[in-house]
Interface confidence: low
């Protein structure tokens, strides 16, 4: 990794042991100021591998609400608007970081957690296994 | 929202003001033990809207490495393996939370940051604007 010189104005950290505990400011800085949030909002319907979005809520997690994509079809939508089962709709997954309250129900103490979410679906050529 | 009774064993928080500062344990708990990491690894190549993955590294961010998807084509791959420009390859984007070192170069002090990443691509029917 890259070695970064320590800033002398850093808050003092007394816990030098792992698991490492750090201070996190929850006042979110949003870097997405130039993006239009509605830009990809209709892709789930217009895609040849359309998907539905399911709300996953967990008050012990931050963010508490995560939207999960579920592909609508096994196949993909063809030019005629029918499902073509020679192709497959598959979920595109991504590992994301969330904060989990630890100990439970604590407002100011969290642990980083990695979870896998399905963001949307894409249409792929199936893997065909030929039997000898 | 859901009201959660406070756990009496929570660490004491002296800073009651916003921006809210919390303690976060960076020893990541991975909830993805049941998933096969190779499961969706080749979708970027098999998709009708294939994409390339670009490495985005920032030592002041946690995680420091994020992979960004860039669609290979403007159109989508048809059954003959050619690009069909009557359809569009578009990125599926997701807002994710990352930790930004703040003040810069501090190992134990972060701020939550929301960034938009492209996770993969999907093939969509274009929106056709009819000119009167």
């Amino acid at each position: 990794g890259i070695t970064i010189p320590r800033n002398p104005g850093c808050p003092n950290s007394e816990d030098k042991n792992f698991p490492r505990t750090v201070m996190v400011n929850l006042n979110i800085h949003n870097r997405n100021t130039n993006t239009n949030p509605k830009r990809s909002s209709d892709y789930y319907n217009r895609s040849t591998s359309p998907w539905n979005l399911h709300r996953n809520e967990d008050p012990e997690r931050y963010p508490s609400v995560i939207w999960e994509a579920k592909c609508r079809h096994l196949g993909c939508i063809n030019a005629d608007g029918n499902v073509d089962y020679h192709m497959n709709s598959v979920p595109i997954q991504q590992e994301i970081l969330v904060l989990r309250r630890e100990p439970p129900h604590c407002p100011n103490s969290f642990r980083l957690e990695k979870i896998l979410v399905s963001v949307g679906c894409t249409c792929v050529t199936p893997i065909v296994h030929h039997v000898a | 929202g859901i009201t959660i009774p406070r756990n009496p064993g929570c660490p004491n928080s002296e800073d009651k003001n916003f921006p809210r500062t919390v303690m976060v344990n960076l020893n990541i708990h991975n909830r993805n033990t049941n998933t096969n990491p190779k499961r969706s690894s080749d979708y970027y190549n098999r998709s009708t809207s294939p994409w390339n993955l670009h490495r985005n590294e920032d030592p002041e961010r946690y995680p420091s490495v994020i992979w960004e998807a860039k669609c290979r084509h403007l159109g989508c791959i048809n059954a003959d393996g050619n690009v069909d420009y009557h359809m569009n390859s578009v990125p599926i984007q997701q807002e994710i939370l990352v930790l930004r070192r703040e003040p810069p170069h501090c190992p134990n002090s972060f701020r939550l940051e929301k960034i938009l990443v492209s996770v993969g691509c999907t093939c969509v029917t274009p929106i056709v604007h009819h000119v009167a």
Partner: nanobody
Framework: QVQLVESGGGLVQAGGSLRLSCAAS????????MGWFRQAPGKEREFVAA????????KYADSVKGRFTMSRDNAKKQVYLEMNSLKPEDTAVYYC????????????????WGQGTQVTVSS
């Protein structure tokens, strides 16, 4: 680690009935549905039925519609397959599995299968 234990199979005469059970443990919080699949000797594994944990909605293969009924018990994390009017062509090893992406999840998405339970229908 997901663990799937199927039971309830056996030998039955054509026209008879059987009830299969599947106990699932280690499912992720995002588990969406459960499915029954079967594999007859010399044939590929095929979809039989599926049920949503959330809504209880079901889906069946055309070959079993009207004869098989799938149900669930969320508290026990168990699913069942009630098989009536059995035919010799229903003879197969029956497997259950998690369907994390809905009732249309493809079988090649699965990393793990249980031992299955043998169903034999004699004529």
């Amino acid at each position: 680690q997901v663990q799937l234990v199927e039971s309830g199979g056996g030998l039955v005469q054509a026209g008879g009935s059987l009830r299969l059970s599947c106990a699932a443990s280690g499912l992720t919080a995002s588990s969406y549905a459960m499915g029954w699949f079967r594999q007859a000797p010399g044939k590929e594994r095929e979809f039989v039925a599926a049920i949503s944990w959330i809504s209880g909605g079901t889906k069946y293969a055309d070959s079993v519609k009207g004869r098989f009924t799938m149900s669930r018990d969320n508290a026990k994390k168990q699913v069942y397959l009630e098989m009536n009017s059995l035919k010799p062509e229903d003879t197969a090893v029956y497997y259950c599995n998690d369907m994390p992406y809905g009732l249309d999840t493809r079988m090649d998405e699965y990393a793990y299968w249980g031992q299955g339970t043998q169903v034999t229908v004699s004529s």
